[in-house]
Interface confidence: medium
């Protein structure tokens, strides 16, 4: 049964599966410039039996300028973009759903591939959240959605995570580490608290950097 | 009243983008209500349901400039708007001086 | 959305006074809240996060404490300057949202 929703989206942060149970379908994308080719796969499919599953079908791009058939390669790493599946930073998460029967591997890249995977999920499929790149995460419990069916319907359970601003590495004077360690704020916490008196905001209504009213007859 | 407002919040002395910056107004007498937020660094705004479509929140990291802008004015949007440095779990630790906006016709 | 509801609405107190100012969350916040103070014409002041933590520089008759979903924000021994309106605030999820406001007035 596929889920009916994408999973929940937490400011700043992105979700990855560790694997994919059988039933989930990855749309056969490609980047700006670049098409499926003429009877090519519109997705890739995870079917499997009890001791093996993998991907079925193949996505294959060629240039929207020509109508020849690219061959398929796997592009270096290098050369890969960002997809908002694969921008998780720590290999580190709490189940390796890879190893579990019935679940297919993140499938090999393709060539000319869009920089964003749409995959569409089934009940049962479990995603993990980390904050993106620059933000960190303070945990009020699980960071990871679940895909559940209660009465007939699907849903995902809701990811215990918020993405704050404040980068580990910043540095500013004055800073002095939090008086405490209060539930919702894991143990593992090192960033400190930024208080200082050198951080001003000034607020106008402005245009630009000058003071002048900036308005718009409605429409 | 159907106009359009931009204000205009400059940080200094801080790592701006590092940071979100919420966006918090208060009409004559009334309490605090936070209009939405935006991580410059990232650049991606989030707005409260009573302002959504009226409100627009954009950053500028080169200046170290945040943007409020709110449109189809009426005259219950006069208020103060502030801007605060809000770091999530540790609060808005640093706020603008506010801007006073009257919608009047 | 979390609603944030603050209570007493005012309250009048002597210099010396004890005052206790109670902010109730519609659902559990954790620990996410913090406490602020305005004067008229200023803009607000943290002065409380995560509940109990106190921002550098404020004074430390100031105190909160609560969980889940009752929080209570102490001020130990009125002071002249403390005379301003306090509001609690949620983090936990968004939107954010702000308790309605206490003002401590002098009795």
């Known amino acids: 049964e596929l889920c009916d929703d994408d999973p929940p989206e937490i400011p700043h942060a992105t979700f990855k599966a560790m694997a994919y149970k059988e039933g989930t379908m990855l749309n056969c994308e490609c980047k700006r410039g670049f098409r499926r080719i003429k009877s090519g796969s519109l997705y890739m499919l995870c079917t499997g039996n009890s001791s093996h599953s993998s991907w079925d079908n193949q996505c294959q791009c060629t240039s929207s300028a020509t109508r020849n058939t690219t061959k398929q390669v796997t592009p270096q790493p290098e050369e890969q973009k960002e997809r908002k599946t694969t921008e998780m930073q720590s290999p580190m998460q709490p189940v390796d759903q890879a190893s579990l029967p019935g679940h297919c591997r993140e499938p090999p890249p393709w060539e000319n591939e869009a920089t964003e995977r749409i995959y569409h999920f089934v009940v049962g499929q479990m995603v993990y959240y980390q904050c993106v790149q620059g933000y960190r995460a303070l945990h009020r419990g699980p960071a990871e959605s679940v895909c559940k069916m209660t009465h007939g319907k699907t849903r995902w359970t809701q990811p215990q995570l918020i993405c704050t601003g404040e980068m580990e590495t910043s540095q500013f004077p004055g800073e002095e580490k939090p008086q405490a360690s209060p539930e919702g704020r894991p143990e593992s916490e090192t960033s400190c608290l930024v208080t200082t008196t050198d951080f001003q905001i000034q607020t106008e209504m402005a245009a630009t950097m000058e003071t002048s009213i900036f308005t718009t007859e409605y429409q | 009243p159907g106009s359009s407002v931009k204000v205009s919040c400059k940080a200094s002395g801080g790592t701006f983008s590092s940071y979100a910056i919420s966006w918090v107004r208060q009409a004559p007498g009334q309490g605090l209500e936070w209009m939405g937020g935006?991580?410059?660094?990232?650049?991606?705004?989030n707005y409260a349901q009573k302002f959504q479509g009226r409100v627009t929140i954009t950053a500028d990291k080169s200046t170290s400039t945040a943007y409020m802008e709110l449109s189809s004015l009426r005259s219950e949007d006069t208020a103060v708007y502030y801007c605060?440095?809000?770091?999530?779990?540790?609060?808005?630790?640093?706020w603008g001086q506010g801007t006073t906006v009257t919608v009047s016709s | 959305d979390i609603q944030m509801t603050q209570s007493p609405s005012s309250v009048s107190a002597s210099v010396g006074d004890r005052v206790t100012i109670t902010c109730r969350a519609s659902?559990?916040?954790?620990?996410?809240l913090a406490w602020y103070q305005q004067k008229p014409g200023k803009a607000p002041k943290l002065l409380i996060y995560?509940?109990?933590s106190l921002q550098s520089g404020v004074p430390s008759r100031f105190s909160g404490s609560g969980s889940g979903t009752d929080f209570t924000l102490t001020i130990s021994s009125l002071q002249p300057e403390d005379f301003a309106t306090y509001y609690c605030q949620q983090s936990y999820s968004l939107p954010l949202t702000f308790g309605g406001g206490t003002e401590v007035l002098i009795k």
């Open positions: 995560a509940v109990s």
């Open positions: 659902q559990g916040i954790s620990s996410w």
């Open positions: 935006i991580i410059p660094i990232f650049g991606t705004a």
């Open positions: 605060a440095r809000d770091k999530g779990y540790y609060g808005m630790d640093v």
